[in-house]
C-alpha cells in the first residue's frame, strides 16, 4: 500500500543525513544550485533546484524521493517563485539547510 507521509518524510530525512555523513569530496563536485524559500511548496522548489544537477549519483535518490512529495512533474530548467533568484549555493549547503528544515517539520508533525 501507500507509504504513510510520516514514513516518507523520515526516509527523506535519513537519506539527506546519509548524504551529509558520507560526504568525502565536495558533493556533486561543488555544483551550485538556486537557493529556495523553505515555505509551502518547498518540496517542488527543492526538486526544481536539484534536478538541474546532472551526473551526481549521490543525490539521485533524493531527487526521486522529492518527486514523491511534489504533485506536478518537474523538469530541468523549470523555476518557481520560491527560488531566491540571483542566490546560488553549493549543493552540500543546500542539502544541510533542507535537512534541518525537514527535521523541524517532522518534529512539528507536518508530514505533507
Amino acid at each position: 500500500g501507500p507509504v504513510p507521509p510520516s514514513t516518507a518524510l523520515r526516509e527523506l530525512i535519513e537519506e539527506l543525513v546519509n548524504i551529509t555523513q558520507n560526504q568525502k569530496a565536495p558533493l556533486c563536485n561543488g555544483s551550485m544550485v538556486w537557493s529556495i524559500n523553505l515555505t509551502a511548496g518547498m518540496y517542488c522548489a527543492a526538486l526544481e533546484s536539484l534536478i538541474n544537477v546532472s551526473g551526481c549519483s549521490a543525490i539521485e535518490k533524493t531527487q526521486r524521493m522529492l518527486s514523491g512529495f511534489c504533485p506536478h512533474k518537474v523538469s530541468a530548467g523549470q523555476f518557481s517563485s520560491l527560488h531566491v533568484r540571483d542566490t546560488k549555493i553549493e549543493v552540500a549547503q543546500f542539502v544541510k539547510d533542507l535537512l534541518l528544515h525537514l527535521k523541524k517539520l517532522f518534529r512539528e508533525g507536518q508530514f505533507n
Epitope: L100, K103, R107
Partner: nanobody, 126 residues
Framework: QVQLQESGGGLVQAGGSLRLSCAAS????????MGWYRQAPGKEREFVAS???????YYADSVKGRFTISRDNAKNTVYLQMNSLKPEDTAVYYC????????????????????WGQGTQVTVSS
Amino acid sequence: QVQLQESGGGLVQAGGSLRLSCAASGTIFVDEFMGWYRQAPGKEREFVASINDGGSTYYADSVKGRFTISRDNAKNTVYLQMNSLKPEDTAVYYCAVFEPSPDGDPFGDRAWFWYWGQGTQVTVSS
C-alpha cells in the same frame, strides 16, 4: 515529539560518584548529538559532555578524566558517569539533543538544540 527524562542526581560527598541517565522517547536521527550541560546557581549553563551516534565523545576541560559519557543507541539513552566529584560540580544537570553547529563543533556553542530535559540536581558536599 521527543521527551527527555533524566535521573540519577542526588547528594554525594566530595570524592564520590554518581551516574546520571537520560532516556529519550521519540525519533533521534543518527547525525544528532546527545549531551549533558549543567547550570550552577547564579551561573550560565555550560557544556559538560556530548556523544554522537558513532560513539565519539567530547568533554569540557573541567571534567576530563573524571566524567565518562556513554550512549545506548537501541534504548535512545545517554549516561554520564561522574567520578571524583568536587563541590564545584554542584549544579542542575540537563540532558540535550542537538545538531552540531555549522562547522561541526560538537560542544554545542552554536548548536541547534532540539530538546532539553527538565534537569536533575547534583549536590556535592565538602
